[in-house]
Amino acid sequence: EVEKTACPSGKKAREIDESLIFYKKWELEACVDAALLATQMDRVNAIPFTYEQLDVLKHKLDELYPQGYPESVIQHLGYLFLKMSPEDIRKWNVTSLETLKALLEVNKGHEMSPQVATLIDRFVKGRGQLDKDTLDTLTAFYPGYLCSLSPEELSSVPPSSIWAVRPQDLDTCDPRQLDVLYPKARLAFQNMNGSEYFVKIQSFLGGAPTEDLKALSQQNVSMDLATFMKLRTDAVLPLTVAEVQKLLGPHVEGLKAEERHRPVRDWILRQRQDDLDTLGLGLQGGIPNGYLVLDLSMQEALS
């Protein structure tokens, strides 16, 4: 806290301008009126204050708005946002997407801070759902944003918002998150034709069930190995050799390089060696001829 001292004669600020950069911290505290600051917040970011001086300006706003800043002030905080704590932000009611964008811009180049996470949480809760415009904005600033949400939070994403999702936005999503997102994506892209549909749905396929993979195998999609390796193991295991061959098309040769990794390894163990041999890739580890193939649920019951 800066101690209360009288403002020196002639130093009382009549407006927020560049002369204030020469003020010491105690002079800013004594000579800048909080109400003046609040009405001229837009000027603060155009003035090269030190971050120590920003601390003083924040303190003045805190005194003026102990219950939380109004949005008219929040949207012009600029670099002062870096000085806010999550506790400060929890007092805010941010409804404008433009305000959100302005504050995210300030934090650009840094990972998502607790302050930013709190701001986004307040904003999304205020809106009731993660609409397309919001998702567009958030993933533009933080490509990993979607994957930072819990499956429960993702369940509030409307299918229409899925159009805003880019492949890189899903890079860090785990299977539980893709399980939630995939049905939404399927719904969102359902009216697209085969090849266009596959391009859009591809990033979400880590959440696809077996029957959808079987359906895709009938559509000449030529899935690449990187996508195949991200599929759910339990969804891949029931696929036949013929279905995998159709699903991968010319990329089927890549199975050899991945034969020791899941889900390929586990899938090989489920296939008849005769069937695997038809691929001509030298895949080994399938079920020898004459052996009984147990149903997967039966295997699990026995183990």
């Epitope: 603060v44 970011n45 090269p48 204050f49 670099y79 990972e111 302050q115």
Partner: antibody
Amino acid sequence: QVQLQQSGPGLVKPSQTLSLTCAISGDSVSSNSVAWNWIRQSPSRGLEWLGRTYYRSKWYNDYAVSVKSRITINPDTSKNQFSLQLNSVTPEDTAVYYCARGIFVVPAVPRFDYWGQGTLVTVSS
Amino acid sequence: DIVMTQSPLSLSVTPGEPASISCRSSLSLLHSNGYNYLDWFLQKPGQSPQLLIYLGSNRASGVPDRFSGSGSDTDFTLKISRVEAEDVGVYYCMQGLHTPPSFGQGTKLEIK
């Protein structure tokens, strides 16, 4: 008044690690208004910024490309200080090493307003 | 990296006479807010550098008013209106707008 007090050996053998410490008084190493920098000065390279550490909800480090593979700058909040480690030194690393406070200025530009006294480090066998 | 070029590299001045040092940047130091992010330092013999001028033209606390900075964009000048014996040392310009910060090679001021 901010003061920076440097300590560390003045002689380091080639291929070894140069280690210096900068003790801060009058400010906090965890302040989110400043960055804590290491800068060196030699006749051949002049003043050369090496890197910085700063806190903004979490710790960040930025390093000069010329030393990126060899440098580590660590804050020590318990002792209110920060350190420099430069690995695999050669005679070219012989210089006077300074720590400096870089107060952030809007937008996020450092202004080196306080400097340590400097430590001459000679790299020689 | 931004290259900072100073001239002259040395100058010898009679006490009471003016001195001028030029600094040129390989990239503009003018931010969209209208400020030039260029600082000047003086390193007196046997001492650490000390901040003289910041933001192109603003004197740091305790710096005598005989020192002034001017210029914009890529061309900057440090002027000493009347050189005094205590002004000897090496003067450096530094840009902080672009990472990494970079310094000029220095201008050595001597007294005649």
